[in-house]
């Protein structure tokens, strides 16, 4: 269940995934899973002591059960 080292470049400037457009690449297990890509920009979470290591995007929960894993509440609404 282990995976090889993850490239830091993948965090700051993600390269294209090996997945088809309707899929997302799950970094925890390093394979493609079904996902919805509808999302809206959100600000950085309030109180974070440094920039979160990702672009602050809010995936929508319902789109075909989207990357369901990716549906989450973030603080700091506009």
């Amino acid at each position: 269940m282990r995976r090889g080292p993850r490239s830091l470049r993948g965090r700051d400037a993600p390269a294209p995934t090996p997945c088809v457009p309707a899929e997302c690449f799950d970094l925890l297990v390093r394979h493609c899973v079904a996902c919805g890509l509808l999302r809206t920009p959100r600000p950085k979470p309030a109180g974070a002591s440094s920039p979160a290591p990702r672009t602050a995007l809010q995936p929508q929960e319902s789109v075909g059960a989207g990357a369901g894993e990716a549906a989450l509440p973030l603080p700091g609404l506009l």
């Epitope: 925890l28 079904a34 990357a67």
Partner: antibody
Amino acid sequence: EVQLVQSGGGVVQPGRSLRLSCAASGFTFSSYGMHWVRQAPGKCLEWVAVIWYDASNKYYGDSVKGRFTISRDNSKNTLYLQMNSLRDEDTAVYYCARRFTHLRGQYIEDYGLDVWGQGTTVTVSS
Amino acid sequence: EIVLTQSPSSLSASVGDRVTITCRASQSISSYLNWYQQKPGKAPKLLIYAASSLQSGVPSRFSGSGSGTDFTLTISSLQPEDFATYYCQQSYSIPLTFGCGTKVEIK
């Protein structure tokens, strides 16, 4: 209110089976991966298993592999842990928890467990 | 499996103190490090995710820093409700692993 309510714990003899349940409410259960984590008395937290939102993938900790099975019924908003061939060392408080992730482009990044059940005690003893 | 080593295992502090807890990973985990608070008889509560991002609803006196193998949780001014056990956890790879905790006690 986002909530996970657990049931199914109890006292069981070594070698026997038990099934734990975790009922979700207040969020779209079918859109989230779910975990089981356990904590033996006075011990560290130990990750047990994870299941994807659609049950397409399941992973287990080495100590339970081949004995425990994680499953879910999205129509009932319920997560399960079937525990077979129980051992004394399986005695612990078991927690269900929601997988917390961010979508970054087409990458899913895992950020831990953001909602936890109240815990249920499993005691394996003869 | 990635081993997380927390230090100290316990500490005594007073209300108002600045408290620092460290977590070291056995290999680089980038920023995939999360912190939890657990009180006796209760489930853990997520405080910090991605090493430094404050979870919604968590007081701003909690902060996290670090990347790679060395991480820190800081409580800027300890409050009575902060006396608890704190755990780090990596979400870089399966199996997920936790540190063994730091118990923050009243001096």
